[in-house]
């Protein structure tokens, strides 16, 4: 994760008896919630691996970096971080591995400085479309988020609701056009089978997109054309068979792009010819010399850069009258 870690060693732990006695009052300047460690010098609060079942109510107003990892939060309700006075300085929030399965509309409202949010390693079966936008208006107030880390948020297969997980995540990313300023989006390890057509066009500020370790088979309907700021595109460890001309041209047209394509099951038949030609010419693919064929069997482990057009044939399709049973 890209959330910052504290460099300060001056952490103070709270006494357990402070737990909820003052939760209804504004926190004292130097107060630290029960089961947390606080460093005012580093503007950091860490409530890590403490089996917390709710977000502490008495977070200090100075907090800039908040780690709530390894807990038992289950649900983030609306206004989970809304406080009086507000947590106006909170810029980085890490909630990874806290067994969240439900994030409700407006969960991150009243955090005007929130730039980095990490929800990785939570089985998010119920992510509200308005989790990040805070309202169901067609155009919401812009979110301050710049980095959104959503790696491994897919629930186990037997725990998923009967709906498209990809669709649920994308709805939250696009609601109200609130994330127009997002620069880093990580969606690795989520079993994505496809990328909904509109998602990238509506995130025009993206610099870094990580879709590694999913199950993407094709990028045919995905357009990268609008992502003129994109610097890194991670597509390693997917199920990609070939990249077609339209995708190749769009990637080549991005001025700052680096693309990562390792560990995909490339099919080295006649449909691969354009991609091989492009790979030989392009500078945008990192580690392109490591890309190898997976199919057909006779081509397995052949290096794509070493192929020529004679290697890339398709078995002829016999007319029905000549096919054998």
């Amino acid at each position: 994760s890209s959330s910052p870690t504290s460099s300060a060693s001056s952490f103070s732990s709270s006494a357990p008896f402070l737990a909820s006695a003052v939760s209804a009052q504004p926190p004292l300047p130097d107060q630290c919630p029960a089961l947390c460690e606080c460093s005012e010098a580093a503007r950091t609060v860490k409530c890590v691996n403490r089996n917390l079942t709710e977000v502490p109510t008495d977070l200090p107003a100075y907090v800039r970096n908040l780690f709530l990892t390894g807990n038992q939060l289950a649900v983030l309700p609306a206004g989970a971080f809304a406080r009086r006075p507000p947590l106006a300085e909170l810029a980085a929030l890490n909630l990874s591995g806290s067994r969240l399965d439900e994030v409700r509309a407006g969960a991150f409202e009243h955090l005007p400085s929130l730039r980095q949010l990490d929800l990785s390693h939570n089985p998010l079966a119920d992510l509200s479309p308005f989790a990040f936008s805070g309202s169901n208006a067609s155009v919401s107030a812009p979110s301050p988020l710049v980095e959104l880390i959503l790696n491994h948020i897919v629930p186990p297969e037997d725990e998923r609701q009967n709906r498209s997980f990809e669709g649920m995540v994308v709805a939250a990313l696009l609601a109200g056009r609130a994330l127009q300023g997002l620069r880093r989006l990580e969606l690795a390890s989520n079993h994505f089978l496809y990328l909904p057509r509109d998602v990238l066009a509506q995130l025009p500020s993206l610099r870094h997109l990580d879709l590694s370790n999913n199950s993407l088979v094709s990028l045919t309907y995905v357009s990268f054309r609008n992502l003129t700021h994109l610097e890194s595109l991670h597509l390693e460890d997917n199920a990609l068979k070939v990249l077609h001309n339209g995708t190749l041209a769009e990637l080549q047209g991005l001025p700052h792009i680096r693309v990562f394509l390792d560990n995909n099951p490339w099919v080295c038949d006649c449909h691969m010819a354009d991609m091989v030609t492009w790979l030989k010419e392009t500078e945008v693919v990192q580690g392109k010399d490591r890309l190898t064929c997976a199919y057909p069997e006779k081509m397995r482990n052949r290096v794509l850069l070493e192929l020529n057009s004679a290697d890339l044939d398709c078995d002829p399709i016999l007319p029905p009258s000549l096919q054998t049973s």
């Epitope: 649900v75 067994r99 439900e102 939570n122 089985p123 079966a125 629930p155 609701q161």
Partner: nanobody, 122 residues
Framework: EVQLVESGGGEVQPGGSLRLSCAAS????????MAWFRQAPGKEREFVAA????????RYAESVKGRFTISRDNAKNTVYLQMSSLRAEDTAVYYC???????????????WGQGTLVTVKP
């Protein structure tokens, strides 16, 4: 409406262990949380522990932390309460409940079982 059936109650000596089970007639998709409550004679019904069907987050009453463990088996639509180091004050009727919220209040839960009696005595 989901039917909840508790089992596993009985009489045990102080320091002993019991495992309660709560079988749901079907996976209660509308109920995201399963919980155990208990009611001792002449006392209010009190929260013991809860678990989420998805993700398996757990929470416990302070009085049972470190002694009781709640778990769930999604394939069997069943929730368990492993109780160890039992004390006389754990004597109560134990109820299984299902609800939407991630709460500890009686009102957070809409579906209830009939209860199973746990008696701890020398």
């Amino acid at each position: 409406e989901v039917q909840l059936v508790e089992s596993g109650g009985g009489e045990v000596q102080p320091g002993g262990s019991l495992r309660l089970s709560c079988a749901a007639s079907r996976r209660p998709f509308s109920s995201k949380t399963m919980a155990w409550f208990r009611q001792a004679p002449g006392k209010e019904r009190e929260f013991v522990a809860a678990v989420r069907w998805i993700g398996g987050a757990t929470r416990y009453a302070e009085s049972v932390k470190g002694r009781f463990t709640i778990s769930r088996d999604n394939a069997k639509n069943t929730v368990y309460l492993q109780m160890s180091s039992l004390r006389a004050e754990d004597t109560a009727v134990y109820y299984c409940a299902a609800g939407q919220a991630w709460g500890t209040k009686f009102t957070d839960y809409s579906d209830w079982g009939q209860g199973t009696l746990v008696t701890v005595k020398p």
